[in-house]
């Protein structure tokens, strides 16, 4: 409900400043609140446009204050006006000057309908003058000069509506200036009914609250709030929830409060007097002090709350036993949330006694809407209203309120949501590279449509044409691969972004197809890569036999491990070896095949073969004698690649014998690198020599090795290492 | 918690008397006006009577007027029918209930009431 | 007395469709002055007393499901149920208080098909 409240300081007009302020408590209004002269109840007044600004010091309230020098323009009738959703408020009030010829009893007056009413003006200055009545700015009454009383009345013994408005009293000599001005409110109803036909019973509206005739509910004078105005403020505070605060150093004194009709205008709670700045009485409270504190149990009357019962007692007397009530407190509830766009579950969590109720705990929108509770639950010390927004969006983005209205008292907590877009990727997800049961895929992030910071990213996918629900893998990189795929088929894969906070998950982005490619036959069994001449492989495997009726071809792949030089030849699947022509001499190649059908098969291991070599082969290299004993003698050697070498043999003689008493030992195993010679004779000298052969010739050794058997009985010398042909 | 706990139904013969009564807690009951409603078996809602904050103001639907008197004792947080000359059509269960504005907010468990010779 | 009608007198909905009740005035319950109508919405289920759940027509009452919604002015009036649950088979009856004596439809038994 909208909550607005009109301040007139002061209502009598000296050379003192004087202002207006009109507040808009604990809601936003869809359009600026406006304060303007009010011609319906004072056709003739001044005419000059208000100045109205801001009030700094809250945030939706707007002022009129008129300089000392102004204070000639000031005379008549002003309101105050908010609208929400389409429903309009109206606050009226009145300032008079303080040297008037007249002063009201009071500056409005609210009766109910068929009550025998008084509106009575008090006499300041005696004047040779007949004394005349005006209603809304129309002569209704005079008084001759001599019959002029202290007390001015016009008296009304059957209100009705009609009779409600603004009443002046001055001097036939007077003007508008010298006006004194009182509103009377006749509510449309008679005393504790209300409705269209005025036929429902009201609740009651404690000190001094005011039933409202359309609606039933109470309008509670300021320093009082709840649903029967029961429940005192804390000191110095007003408004429908007690969350304004007199700022002056006196709290409200001075401070008239003028509320939506039939309430009209009155003192805060403890305040008294035209101009709120007289303090009740002993043994009073309440707004115009007009409340008499009756305490039961003799406790102590203040006079802005009235009895202050003793514990274990309450009520307006203390007149009930029972735990005292306390004002709802509303929890846990922090100043700014952020919320991602989608479903909201906001929680208002109270305390207070009686704890508050479902029905008592709502929550509104910044656009005025009001949410009731969804859910509810109670613990001993607080009642926690959940509320449903089914799709929140960034317009619901603003200040929001949570309310709570108990019997105890009301209190509101205006608390910021802003409410972030859930972020979408702009682009679909590439494809790199596929195979029959993966596929790497870069996801595209970036850019994305909404709101980051994004703080994880899922790859969705899903077979197209089957019924499953999508798969997904969290990523961190921008460059993932997907394993275990089915082959042969065509997948749909898109990414899901999720930002911080609940609900965060992000509407997948647009979707990218692939299909993945059919699985392939094993590769050919029984390989085997050996050299044919310079030029040539042969590749053989064994006989291939499918298990489908599809046609298969063998494709062998050749590359030169030397040069950039790639071949792939096919090879019907019936044949079971290939001869790979044109190579270079002594060159490497590396070689592998698969059986392809539709499908390409998997690829074999790599083989490695040379071709023969075209030159004769180098020496071996590294010759070293060692283990020499007296009868034996270790020789070793390394050999280069790639000369088809394909034996070696070592030549060894008693050295100063013939050449053809030589011993040649031809060791056919060219990986062998070390061979063991035995049966030498004890202290003598023989000549090595150490020949590689290939399909082109033996190698031509430079020189000749020295070797020196030992004496018997003698240790070995020197150990050798590698492959040792005993 | 809001609560209303009626008490005093039961079997009564035609032109007999019955008195209801309805006992609240959980709120100020001495600030709110209260109802009776009720209704007959398989039949819609009847309002019946209510009663003003201070007992001051009843009205009654003018098929109970003159036999039934609501009241109400504030200090005791209680509210009552008392229930005069009962006929077969008065048989029903009878709620005592708070009003929100002209709708009725809270009601009580209800209360049979069997008119029968 | 201001007589109030609802149609139909019973109604079978599919759980999860929309399920709609009206309700007519043998005079407007609007009250021009405030733009307000005095018309109230309840749900009773076996052997419970009645719920509130709308008041002014309109007004959602607290802790009644947003799928729950009121419209409606002058003399006709109708109460949604967006999508039905299975907790909301019940008798609804639409009130006026625009007048007294308060008055109550006869009922809409709402069940599902």
């Known amino acids: 409900a909208m909550d607005l409240i009109l301040i007139n300081s002061l209502p009598l007009v000296s050379d003192a400043e004087t202002s207006l302020t009109c507040i808009a408590s604990g809601w936003r209004p869809h359009e600026p609140i406006t304060i303007g002269r009010d011609f319906e109840a004072l056709m003739n007044q001044h005419q000059d446009p208000l100045e109205v600004t801001q009030d700094v010091t809250r945030e939706w309230a707007k002022k009129v204050v008129w300089k000392r020098e102004k204070a000639s323009k000031i005379n008549g009738a002003y309101f105050c006006e908010g609208r929400v959703r389409g429903e309009a408020i109206r606050i009226r009030t009145m300032k008079m000057r303080q040297q008037a010829s007249f002063l009201p009893a009071t500056l409005t007056m609210t009766v109910d309908k068929g009550d025998n009413v008084n509106i009575s003006f008090k006499k300041v200055l005696i004047k040779e003058e007949d004394a005349v009545i005006y209603k809304n700015g129309s002569f209704i009454h005079s008084v001759p000069r001599h019959e002029v009383p202290d007390i001015l009345e016009v008296h009304l013994p059957h209100a009705q509506p009609q009779d409600a408005g603004v009443y002046s009293a001055r001097y036939i000599g007077g003007n508008l200036f010298t006006s004194a001005f009182t509103r009377l409110i006749v509510r449309r109803c008679e005393a504790q009914k209300w409705g269209p036909e005025c036929n429902h019973l009201c609740t009651a509206c404690m000190n001094n609250g005011v039933c409202h005739e359309d609606t039933g509910e109470c309008i509670c004078p300021p320093g009082f709030m709840g649903r029967t105005c029961e429940k005192a403020c804390e000191l110095h505070t007003f408004g429908r929830t007690c969350k304004e605060r007199c700022s002056g150093q006196e709290g409200c004194k001075s401070y008239v409060f003028c509320l939506p009709d039939p309430y009209g205008c009155s003192c805060a709670t403890g305040w008294k007097g035209l101009q709120c700045n007289e303090a009740c009485h002993p043994g009073f409270y309440g707004p115009d002090c007009k409340l008499r504190c009756s305490c039961n149990n003799g406790e102590m009357c203040d006079r802005f709350q009235g009895c202050l019962c003793s514990p274990g007692w309450q009520g307006l007397q203390c007149e009930r036993e029972g735990i005292p009530r306390m004002t709802p407190k509303i929890v846990d509830l922090p100043d700014h949330i952020e919320v991602n766009s989608g479903k909201f579950n906001p929680i208002c969590k109270a305390s207070g006694w009686p704890l508050p109720t479902n029905e008592e705990m709502t929550l509104v929108k910044p656009d005025g809407t009001v949410l009731h509770p969804k859910d509810f639950n109670h613990t001993d010390h607080f009642s926690v209203a959940i509320f449903t927004i089914h799709r929140i969006l960034p317009p619901d983005s603003g200040v929001w309120v949570c309310s709570v209205n108990t019997v105890a008292g009301m209190v509101e907590k205006p608390f910021n949501i802003s409410v972030k877009v859930l972020p979408k990727p702009l682009n679909a997800p590439n494809v790199i590279d596929t195979g029959h049961n993966f596929a790497v895929i870069n996801i595209s992030s970036e850019p994305y449509f909404g709101d980051g910071p994004i703080k994880s990213k899922k790859l969705l996918y899903k077979p197209v044409n089957h019924y499953e629900a999508w798969q997904h893998i969290q990523v961190t990189n921008e460059i993932v691969t997907l394993n275990y795929l089915e082959p042969r088929t065509e997948y749909e894969l898109c990414v899901q972004l999720v930002r911080r906070g609940e609900g965060g998950e992000g509407h997948p982005g647009p979707v990218r197809r692939f299909t993945t490619a059919s699985i392939g036959l094993p590769p050919p069994r029984g390989l085997n890569l050996l050299p044919k001449s310079q030029t040539t492989l042969n590749l053989t495997w064994q006989p291939i036999f499918p298990s489908s009726e599809d046609d298969f071809y063998v494709e062998v792949e050749r590359r030169s491990v030397q040069k950039s030089d790639q071949q792939n030849i096919k090879v019907p699947g019936n044949l079971t070896s290939v001869l790979l022509n044109n190579l270079h001499p002594r060159e490497q190649y590396v070689v592998r095949a698969r059986v392809n059908t539709k499908a390409q098969g998997e690829w074999s291991e790599d083989l490695t073969a040379w071709t023969l070599s075209d030159i004769l082969p180098p020496q071996p290299e590294n010759i070293k004698i060692s283990n020499i004993t007296h009868s034996s003698a270790v020789i070793s050697w390394t050999i280069l690649d790639g000369y088809s070498i394909s034996s070696i043999t070592i030549r060894y003689k008693v050295q100063g014998k013939n050449e053809d008493q030589h011993v040649d030992v031809k060791i056919k195993n060219a990986t062998i690198t070390q061979y063991q010679l035995k049966g030498l004779e004890p202290e003598t000298a023989y000549q090595v020599d150490i020949f590689a052969e290939n399909n082109i010739g033996s190698s031509n050794p430079a020189f000749s090795h020295e070797l020196v058997t030992l004496p018997e009985s003698q240790a070995p010398a020197d150990l050798g290492g590698g492959k040792m042909l005993l | 918690q809001v609560q209303l706990v009626q008490s005093g139904g039961g079997v009564v013969q035609p032109g007999r008397s019955l008195r209801l009564s309805c006992a609240a807690s959980?709120?100020?009951?001495?600030?709110?006006?209260m109802h009776w409603a009720r209704q007959a078996p398989g039949k819609g809602l009847e309002w019946v009577a209510v009663?003003?904050?201070?007992?001051?103001?009843?009205y009654y639907a003018d098929s109970v007027k003159g036999r039934f008197t609501i009241s109400r004792d504030n200090s005791k947080n209680m509210l009552q029918l008392q229930m005069n000359r009962l006929r077969s059509e008065d048989t029903a269960v009878y709620y005592c209930?708070?009003?929100?504005?002209?709708?009725?907010?809270?009601w009580g468990q209800g209360t049979v009431i069997t008119v029968s010779s | 007395d201001i007589q109030m009608t609802q149609s139909p007198d019973s109604l079978a909905v599919s759980l999860g469709e929309r399920a709609t009740i009206n309700c007519k005035s043998s005079?407007?319950?609007?009250?021009?002055?405030?733009?307000?109508?005095?018309l109230a919405w309840y749900q009773q289920k076996p052997g419970q007393p009645p719920n509130l759940l709308m008041y002014?027509?309109?007004t959602r009452e607290s802790g009644v499901p947003d799928r729950f919604s009121g419209s409606g002015s002058g003399t006709d009036f109708t109460l949604t149920i967006s999508s039905l649950q299975a907790e909301d088979v019940a008798v609804y009856y639409c009130?006026?208080?625009?007048?007294?004596?308060?008055?109550f439809g006869q009922g809409t038994r709402l069940e599902i098909k």
């Open positions: 009663i003003s904050y201070d007992g001051e103001n009843k």
């Open positions: 959980g709120l100020t009951f001495s600030n709110y006006a």
């Open positions: 209930a708070t009003p929100k504005g002209g709708a009725l907010e809270i």
């Open positions: 009130q006026q208080y625009y007048s007294a004596p308060i008055t």
């Open positions: 002014w027509a309109s």
């Open positions: 005079q407007s319950v609007l009250y021009s002055s405030n733009n307000k109508n005095y």
